[in-house]
Interface confidence: low
């Protein structure tokens, strides 16, 4: 018999955690697991418990995590990696829409995230979407073109800026931008 199936690893309430705010990492395997191992990659930090409660997020806790479990002498495959991001490390960027935040269905709009600092990475979040759009941009202005806009593009957007040198330390979120599709 091969390795045990991998567990799942999630961050609650979110894997984007403002500095000094709490987050819980939870490793979930099948019922009756003998032992869990939750580890922070590229470090020697680990714990033999399924749940890691971080009462106040710190810069040094940002990074990649994974977990596995043991039943008898068998270890499971490792979970998918979880990227835990500390936000609020840097000042917020500004988010704007060109030509404007109101766009006709079928039209085009570009969301631009701008920062005064020398960041080369930007992430755009739409409220309700699970994952960000990431866009490396050399000139510190990230453009996210949305071609042929539909009603599904309506919503609230925020962007973050960060550096590829420290990819898990992000700025505070920009002020929200409401995109209206008419």
């Amino acid at each position: 018999s091969g390795p045990l199936p991998k567990p799942s690893l999630q961050a609650l309430p979110s894997s984007l955690v403002p500095l000094e705010k709490p987050v819980t990492l939870r490793c979930q395997g099948p019922p009756g697991v003998d032992l869990y191992r939750l580890e922070k990659l590229s470090s020697s930090r680990y714990q033999d418990q399924a749940v890691l409660f971080i009462p106040a997020m710190k810069r040094s806790l940002a990074g990649r995590y994974r977990c596995s479990y043991q039943n008898g002498s068998l270890w499971s495959l490792p979970s998918d990696q979880l990227e835990l991001v500390a936000t609020g490390v840097f000042a917020k960027p500004s988010l704007s829409a060109q030509p404007g935040p109101a766009v006709s269905s079928g039209g085009d709009v570009t969301l631009q995230c701008q920062t005064r600092y020398g960041f080369d990475q930007f992430a755009l979040y739409k409220e309700g979407d699970p994952a960000p759009y990431k866009n490396p941009e050399r000139w510190y202005r990230a453009s996210f073109p949305i071609i042929t806009v539909t009603a599904a593009h309506s919503g609230t957007y925020r962007c973050y800026s960060f550096s590829s040198r420290d990819p898990y330390l992000w700025s505070a979120p920009s002020d929200p931008l409401e995109l209206v599709v008419t």
């Epitope: 922070k40 020697s44 714990q47 409660f53 971080i54 009462p55 710190k58």
Partner: nanobody, 129 residues
Amino acid sequence: QVQLQESGGGLVQAGGSLRLSCAPSGRTISSVDVGWFRQAPGKEREFVAHVTWSGGSTYAADSVKGRFTVSRDNAKNTVYLQMNSLKPEDTAVYYCAAALNGAFRDSWYPALWDEYDYWGQGTQVTVSS
């Protein structure tokens, strides 16, 4: 709120010993992880040693390993840094710091300053040659 008070610093000759104490008020020390740091003039704050809340795990930086030991006495609500075979380069202000609920409790290596919640005012240690 936790206030930390270090004591035991002073002037000592190279090769001598000192024992620093750290006594928190406002909270029993048995519920916090405690680290020691030091800062020499014009230098960065440097991690020295750490003891977990249970005392079950201690860690010392390479620069002091074998010379400094950290321990705790929860009954006396005090954490100690025993410093032996002191060298002139150990001259610095020594700070103790408390982490109210450290993540990864007993595998906290290396201890990083930003994970500590409260800091003492520091005690001066001067080692003369």
